[in-house]
């Protein structure tokens, strides 16, 4: 067991041109806080994946208001360290994510607004009990300077916090076969409780007689480095010399995840997905309370009055996740109907409706004919939400206001000539053709393709099209 400690030294504009604008203003004062997320091994996981080694939030920094016209200085920081406790062995290699958050203190509806200013990440090797390591990371135009270390919590000592120390029983020396615990010379190594031969560098135990391996090591005494090559069976052949994992119970057998965490196997070990309020390699750590302000983006924290009870974040619209840290794709719920397109404007959703539809979700099929007259005797026809006028003869256009030229479409066939008429059009047919559109040839013997010409009209006379 032990604690990872992070000390933020400064957060401000990086060197070089293009200094960032101050995140705070006279109109919108703000303050900073930090979040650290730790994962074991040199994993290159997404920022959203579980912080299996633990996570911590800093206190809020002092309120800061930008001086008009001044460049962004190093911003005032929260007091104190960020501390991430770990119960198991320190893995030696770890990945970190450090986020700088801005809390805006203006007249926000529903409380302060939180936004992520910068996120830095890295992968490091670190022995527990060593000195502070200094680091500088850049995110865009911002620069974060910090130090970190891992220290063991008594009685654990060593680079992985796996060796145990006890106060001396005799004033002068340790018991037979036991060494003083450097640098705590007044303490001695505790009697060996792990399985005999268990590697002191790569193995550890929590129960007498057991030997559990750190990541990257295998074998009954944790003396065989894991190699992913030449493994034949699902968990590798049984020969310890190959360096493959020994077949047998899987890492998730018996579910090592506490507090309702769910276990999934990884290539070398296992990973616990923890419920709200718990973190750590086995979901064993529950150190975040509502007092830490774990809910981002204006989420409301409920419960979690003490470190042993889980908190729950009730997220505002548009956010989800156990800490309201993820933006919801609200449009993925397909709220818009009738072909309307969904726009997420951040502060609100909007449906852009197609013609003929209206309403917040485009749910109303507009009666386009209501209150919309078609001129010149036209009648209104609805269809598919669109308004259309069926116009009387001689008129056209959307509202039948345009005088139509009935001859514009050249309706008379076979060279017939078209004449506009008050009730439509008249075709004067060329010799040899008849019909309203001159569409019928007259047979050479004088009989037409029609049974008979209407009374009063001879073949070849102009035919009025009614």
């Amino acid at each position: 067991a032990g604690v990872f400690e992070l000390q933020i030294h400064s957060f401000g504009p990086g060197p070089g041109p293009g200094a960032p604008r101050s995140p705070c203003s006279a109109r919108l004062p703000c303050r900073l806080f930090f979040r650290v997320c730790l994962k074991p091994g040199l994993s290159e996981e997404a920022a959203e994946s579980p912080c299996a080694l633990g996570a911590a939030l800093s206190a809020r920094g002092p309120v800061y208001t930008e001086q008009p016209g001044a460049p962004a200085p190093d911003l005032p920081l929260p007091d104190g360290l960020l501390q991430v406790p770990f119960r198991d062995a320190w893995p030696g290699t770890f990945s970190f994510i450090i986020e700088t958050w801005r809390e805006e203190l203006g007249d926000q509806i529903g409380g302060p607004a939180w936004s992520l200013l910068a996120r830095v990440a890295g992968r490091r090797r670190l022995a527990a009990g060593g000195p502070w390591a200094r680091d500088i990371q850049r995110a865009g135009a911002w620069e974060l300077r910090f130090s970190y270390r891992a220290r063991c919590e008594p009685p654990a000592v060593g680079t992985a916090c796996t060796r145990l120390c006890r106060p001396r029983s005799a004033p002068s020396r340790c018991g037979p076969g036991l060494r003083p615990c450097a640098p705590l010379e007044d303490e001695c190594e505790a009697p060996l409780v792990c399985r005999a031969g268990c590697s002191p560098e790569h193995g550890f135990c929590e129960q007498p007689g057991e030997c559990r391996c750190l990541e990257g090591w295998t074998g009954p005494l944790c003396t065989v480095p894991v190699s992913t090559s030449s493994c034949l069976s699902p968990r590798g052949p049984s020969s310890a010399t190959t360096g493959c994992l020994v077949p047998g119970p899987g890492p998730c057998d018996g579910n090592p995840c506490a507090n309702g965490g769910s276990c999934s196997e990884t290539p070398r070990s296992f990973e616990c997905t923890c419920p709200r309020g718990f973190y750590g390699l086995r979901c064993e750590v529950s150190g975040v309370t509502c007092a830490d302000g774990p809910c981002f983006n204006g989420g409301l924290c409920v419960g979690g009055a003490d470190p042993d009870s889980a908190y729950i974040c009730h997220c505002p619209p548009g956010f989800q996740g156990s800490n309201c840290e993820k933006r919801v794709d609200r449009c993925s719920l397909q709220p818009c109907r009738n072909g309307g397109l969904c726009l997420d404007l951040g502060h609100a959703l909007r449906c852009r409706c197609r013609a003929g539809f209206a309403g917040p979700r485009c749910e109303h099929d507009l009666d386009d004919c209501a209150g919309r007259a078609c001129a010149n005797g036209g009648t209104c026809v609805e269809g598919g939400g669109a308004h259309r006028c069926s116009c009387a003869l001689g008129f056209g256009g959307r509202d039948c206001r345009e005088r139509a030229d009935p001859c514009a479409a050249r309706p008379c066939a076979h060279g017939g000539r078209c004449y506009a008429h008050f009730s439509g059009l008249v075709c004067a047919c060329a010799p040899g053709y008849m019909g309203a559109r001159c569409e019928f040839p007259v047979h050479p013997d004088g009989a037409s393709a029609l049974p008979a010409a209407p009374p009063g009209l001879r073949p070849g006379d102009p035919q009025r099209y009614l």
Partner: antibody, heavy 124, light 111 residues
Amino acid sequence: QVQLQQSGPGLVKPSQTLSLTCAISGDSVSSNSVVWNWIRQSPSRGLEWLGRTYYRSKWYDDYAVSVKSRITINPDTSKNQFSLQLNSVTPEDTAVYHCARGGIVGAPDAFDIWGQGTMVTVSS
Amino acid sequence: QSVLTQPPSASGTPGQRVTISCSGSSSNIGSDPVSWYQQFPGTAPKLLIYTNNQRPSGVPDRFSGSKSGTSASLAISGLQSEDEADYYCAAWDDSLNGHVFGTGTKVTVLT
């Protein structure tokens, strides 16, 4: 990762029909959260949106006023592609034609993935 | 042809801040979100900003967008030589019922 691959002739005669196809990989033409667009670019007209097709329980399409009377955009679900047909072309239609996806949920107007572009010349 | 108006050119030295404006009307920028695109010669445009001020993943935070009324602007802080390109704004136009693009601005990095 989503990619759009355009195909079609680079030379079309005046009064004929310009036909281009945009093949989609890594996404589905009938996804109900994206919009599939055709856009063209020429020195004289700049970037010009031509139209789009999209699926929301059924297929919809929209066309720019300037080409509405002679454009058709069709999805082809069997080949996971969509096509552009522009009838009665003139030399004014000479441009680089792009297909593009409006694929950011909540931002259908943002074209996040583009095809490689096809230079189409209208000339006899 | 283009409904949205941009200055034809803008320039700055490396490290400077350059701002490009995009002027529209109540039927486009005034009522709908704005996108910004970057285009290098011979390539398709690339989305830089959507919904006025949102950056897709992979776009450096040197690029930022804002909108006020019927105008929008794109700011490039800490200008770099690789930012030399054409930049276009775009929005939906409710009266035309279609997308409209800006006239385009050529950004030159002076050395």
